[in-house]
Interface confidence: medium
């Protein structure tokens, strides 16, 4: 799996996607979950509805939520009041027994404030490194509240 | 178990630009999880941030030093670097690379002393 | 900018002593705060991170506690070895911001 960049702004929301083929993860529920190092465990954050057929209701865990649109076959991750410890290397998972396939890696980058941005054609260098040919910078650096999500209150 | 180790001029003269280089060994800088680290330490002083970069090559800085910082990497060469312009003898110090993990700072290079002194 | 302000600056100690350090923060940083051992002309040691986890290969004598604005790092019997100066470090909100240090030394 090559890694995606989510880059956001800290104290902002970032919007993470996971798209999947809808028909070979149908009846599976989804997860979120932190890398622990580059070879460490993948420590779950959050998942989806323990029902997967409610599995579009949106679950919180702190400052993270996750909703599934099992039929469009998009798994979305909202980090709320991002911060500096929110970087890092993540997963979207999915979940069938004990086991858990990878539907995409994230690496979420936090960034001071907007100016700190810039253009993926800055950042990208292909050809300078192996790992960085099919590397993919998604922006989401800031966004408005969902419809119906609840403007909780920042923490710290 | 991964090392880094600074590299540079010992002695910088005024309005002169510091150059760094922390290589890193035992890891990889482009494999992801973790960001790279620019720390310095005053003589007889406390710590300060001047900020990290990530392997995709973004950076955030410490907005006191902003104007004057430049952090950059090169994969290839699994080693990322500090300029710092226009330096005065208050930029006297010791300088650490450091790998950062979840926001902990657990790898550090054993630093460098760079005087800035005509 | 956060503000991490450490007391005592210093503190004269004997081996086997219970030393306590705090560290207090501006504004609340939830449980988003390190502590590390720096020896002279050594690099800074991750000692405790997320404000109560002891790293690995650290010292069980080690210990924090806290969690909003106020935090505690306590050596509960000082060894020799444990003479240096103790940083907390703050990484809630940029820019990341060090304590001044303790200096714990021998009496």
């Known amino acids: 799996h090559n890694t995606t960049v989510f880059q956001g702004v800290a104290g902002q929301s970032l919007q993470v996607s996971c798209p999947y083929d809808s028909m070979k993860h149908w009846g599976r529920r989804k997860a979120w979950c932190r890398q622990l190092g580059e070879k460490g465990p993948c420590q779950r954050v959050v998942s989806t509805h323990n029902l997967w057929l409610l599995s579009f209701l949106r679950r919180w865990n702190g400052s993270t939520a996750i909703t599934d649109d099992t039929l469009g076959g998009t798994l979305t991750i909202t980090l709320r009041n991002l911060q500096p410890h929110d970087a890092g290397l993540y997963q979207c998972q999915s979940l069938h027994g004990s086991e858990a396939d990878t539907l995409r890696k994230v690496l979420v980058e936090v960034l001071a404030d907007p100016l700190d941005h810039r253009d993926a054609g800055d950042l990208w260098f292909p050809g300078e490194s192996e790992s960085f040919e099919d590397a993919h910078v998604e922006h989401s650096i800031s966004r408005s509240l969902l419809e119906g999500e609840i403007p909780f209150p920042p923490t710290s | 178990q991964v090392q880094l180790q600074e590299s540079g001029p010992g002695l910088v003269k005024p309005s002169q630009t510091l150059s760094l280089t922390c290589t890193v060994s035992?890891?990889?800088?482009?494999?992801?999880?973790?960001?790279w680290s620019w720390i310095r330490q005053h003589p007889g002083k406390g710590l300060e941030w001047i900020g990290y970069?990530?392997?995709?090559?973004?950076?955030v800085y410490n907005p006191s030093l902003k104007s004057r910082v430049t952090i950059s990497v090169d994969t290839s060469k699994n080693q990322f670097s500090l300029k710092l312009s226009s330096v005065t003898a208050a930029d006297t110090a010791v300088y650490y690379c450091a790998r950062v993990s979840s926001s902990w700072y657990k790898a550090w290079g054993q630093g460098t002393m760079v005087t800035v002194s005509s | 900018d956060i503000q991490m302000t450490q007391s005592p600056s210093s503190v004269s100690a004997s081996v086997g002593d219970r030393v306590t350090i705090t560290c207090r923060a501006s504004q609340g940083i939830s449980s988003w705060l390190a502590w590390y051992q720096q020896k002279p002309g050594k690099a800074p040691k991750l000692l405790i991170y997320a404000a109560s986890s002891l790293q690995s290969g650290v010292p069980s004598r080690f210990s924090g506690s806290g969690s909003g604005t106020d935090f505690t790092l306590t050596i509960s019997s000082l060894q020799p070895e444990d003479f240096a100066t103790y940083y907390c470090q703050q990484a809630s909100t940029f820019p990341i911001t060090f304590g001044g240090g303790t200096k714990v030394e021998i009496k």
């Open positions: 970069i990530y392997y995709s090559g973004s950076t």
């Open positions: 035992g890891g990889s800088i482009s494999s992801g999880g973790y960001y």
